[in-house]
Interface confidence: low
């Protein structure tokens, strides 16, 4: 009867430089000894090596020399007694590309190289990008923990070095941005900026990076009303505080633009004397058109901003005058500075 030496292992495996791969493997060999149980030793060799004196890439035999370049990176995983020859390859290097064969040795009778089932390993350029994890949405002023990890990397080989960059991090000591984890307290101005995590395997020229655009939620700020006069001057009055009185001539046409900075965008609505204005008069962008203003169409105009992180409003008084004076005068109810003319 022919002795049964069988090996189940995939013919080829591809891994990106610096990453890890697990190659499942099982084997069988003839063993019918009732009287002694010598140790079972298994080996992975580079193809073309002579098993008797070559250095191995991985083994469970403590007396055999392992190639320095694969030491700690090529490891046997699983229980060889259960005929598991699975091979873990970590921190893959371009020079690892090639063929490998498996060998089993037990006592005097079992010494066999499975030359017909070779494993072909191909190491390709690193295109895997790190993952940046954090709980969304980011909220202005609330500290958030971000983590960076490289899928497919594992414990084998030298550790990974992390570098974080981005305007939201400035100014940080390099030491703070070298960890895989980072605590960020975003500001409104960080919304839309880029955050990059770069991963490098220490001692290797293998780097990869991922950039994410920060989506920072923040409450409404810089609420302002701009009043545009359609009298050819192109002048705009900018109202930044409540209670300002704006005199205008009867028959003039105005555009009122309410602007606010927030994320997500706030909902803007206009009120006159406390009553919501007809949506047909206002646009989605918060612009209100007042064509050919009549004597009774003045009063308090309010822009109301509604947002999940807070609501605000800004009011001014439109005083419609019948006089034929051509000057545009602006007064405030309370003492204070004159509005900014832009």
């Amino acid at each position: 009867e022919k002795p049964v030496y069988e090996l189940q292992v995939q013919k080829s495996v591809t891994v990106q430089e610096g990453l890890c791969v697990l190659v499942p493997c099982s084997f069988s060999y003839p063993w019918r000894s009732w009287y002694s149980s010598p140790p079972l030793y298994v080996y992975w060799f580079r193809d073309g090596e002579i098993p008797y004196y070559a250095e191995v890439v991985a083994t469970n035999n403590p007396d055999r020399r392992v190639k320095p370049e694969t030491q700690g990176r090529f490891r046997l995983l699983g229980d060889v007694q259960k005929k598991n020859c699975s091979l873990s390859i970590g921190d893959a290097r371009m020079e690892d590309t090639g063929s490998y064969f498996f060998r089993v040795e037990r006592g005097r009778d079992v010494k066999y190289s499975y030359q017909q089932n070779k494993l072909n390993l191909e190491v390709t350029a690193l295109i895997e990008k790190p993952d940046i994890h954090f709980l969304e949405p980011l909220e202005s002023g609330r500290p958030t923990r971000l983590s960076c990890s490289l899928p497919g990397s594992c414990e084998a080989g030298p550790p990974l070095t992390f570098s974080w960059t981005g305007n939201a991090l400035s100014p940080l000591d390099p030491e703070t941005t070298r960890s895989s984890e980072l605590t960020l307290t975003p500001r409104p101005e960080d919304h839309g900026t880029n955050l990059t995590c770069q991963v490098k395997r220490q001692g290797a020229q293998v780097t990869t990076e991922r950039t994410v655009q920060l989506n920072v939620s923040y409450a409404p700020q810089n609420l302002a009303i701009s009043i545009f006069f359609r009298n050819g001057t192109g002048t705009a009055l900018r109202i930044l505080s409540n209670g300002m009185s704006v005199p205008i001539q009867e028959g003039q046409s105005l555009f009122l633009a309410c602007t606010v900075d927030s994320n997500p965008p706030a909902s803007l609505s206009w009120f006159r004397e406390g009553k919501a204005l007809n949506p047909s008069q206002t646009s989605m962008s918060g612009t209100l058109e007042l064509p050919n203003i009549g004597a009774r169409e003045g009063g308090e105009f309010t822009c109301r901003v509604q947002h999940p992180l807070g609501s605000q409003h800004l009011s001014f008084i439109l005083s419609v005058q019948r006089s034929s004076s051509s000057c545009i005068c602006v007064t405030e109810k309370q003492q204070g500075s004159w509005p900014l003319l832009t």
Partner: antibody, heavy 118, light 107 residues
Framework: EIQLQQSGPELVKPGASVKVSCKAS????????MYWVKQSHGKSLECFGY????????YYNQKFKGKATLTVDKSSSTAFMHLNSLTSEDSAVYYC???????????WGQGTLVTVSA | DIVMTQSQKFMSTSVGDRVSVTCKAS??????VAWYQQKPGQSPKSLIY???YRYSGVPDRFTGSGSGTDFTLTISNVQSEDLAEYFC?????????FGSGTKLEIK
């Protein structure tokens, strides 16, 4: 605080060789590449090459290949540049610089002036 | 090798002015560009990395911009201590290469 301390100025004769050292402190020496940069008098900066202290592997700018040998002593966190067959063209200030990946080169040594003169 | 061209060898400015130093790469280098300031007899001082990020401790009057092949270092409100030579450098590919430098003179 990260510091790169270079050896003092050297006056050597043409054809001789010189060894410039750069002692690193304040960070894990084997984590980051050490660059060597040449600056001739009144000229710009040129990258000579770098060495990866983790495995001692050097990279040489083809333009200067054969002119320098880069080595490290991990036990003392020191990088060395050995310049050979010196000519007047090699008279320059040589800087070691710590390369920090995406951060470029944030730290430089104070420079070592090498003067080649008969 | 990637060539970094700083076409202006000298630039003259006055205290309080705003000045822009430009640098052009022969190939696309993304944002892997740094700017250095060098004063006579001193080693280069790192100002900007990754095209637009200031190193810690660098005054905010120094700003970097650009990506791809065109890069600018802008100094607003120039101070007398800014009198120096400014170099750009790419670290997108080996060998790392530097621009020829732009000397800033104060009138």
């Amino acid at each position: 605080e990260i510091q790169l301390q270079q050896s003092g100025p050297e006056l050597v004769k043409p054809g001789a060789s010189v060894k410039v050292s750069c002692k690193a402190s304040g960070y894990s020496f084997t984590d980051y590449n050490m660059y060597w940069v040449k600056q001739s008098h009144g000229k710009s900066l040129e990258c000579f090459g770098y060495i990866d202290p983790y495995n001692g592997g050097p990279y040489y700018n083809q333009k200067f290949k054969g002119k320098a040998t880069l080595t490290v002593d991990k036990s003392s966190s020191t990088a060395f540049m050995h310049l050979n067959s010196l000519t007047s063209e090699d008279s320059a200030v040589y800087y070691c610089a710590f390369y920090y990946g995406y951060y470029g080169v944030p730290y430089w040594g104070q420079g070592t002036l090498v003067t080649v003169s008969a | 090798d990637i060539v970094m061209t700083q076409s202006q060898k000298f630039m003259s400015t006055s205290v309080g002015d705003r000045v822009s130093v430009t640098c052009k790469a022969s190939h696309n280098v993304g944002t892997s560009v740094a700017w250095y300031q060098q004063k006579p007899g001193q080693s280069p001082k790192s100002l900007i990395y990754s095209a637009s990020y200031r190193y810690s401790g660098v005054p905010d009057r120094f700003t970097g911009s650009g990506s791809g092949t065109d890069f600018t270092l802008t100094i607003s409100n120039v101070q007398s201590e800014d009198l120096a030579e400014y170099f750009c450098q790419q670290y997108n590919s080996y060998p790392l290469t530097f621009g020829s430098g732009t000397k800033l003179e104060i009138k």
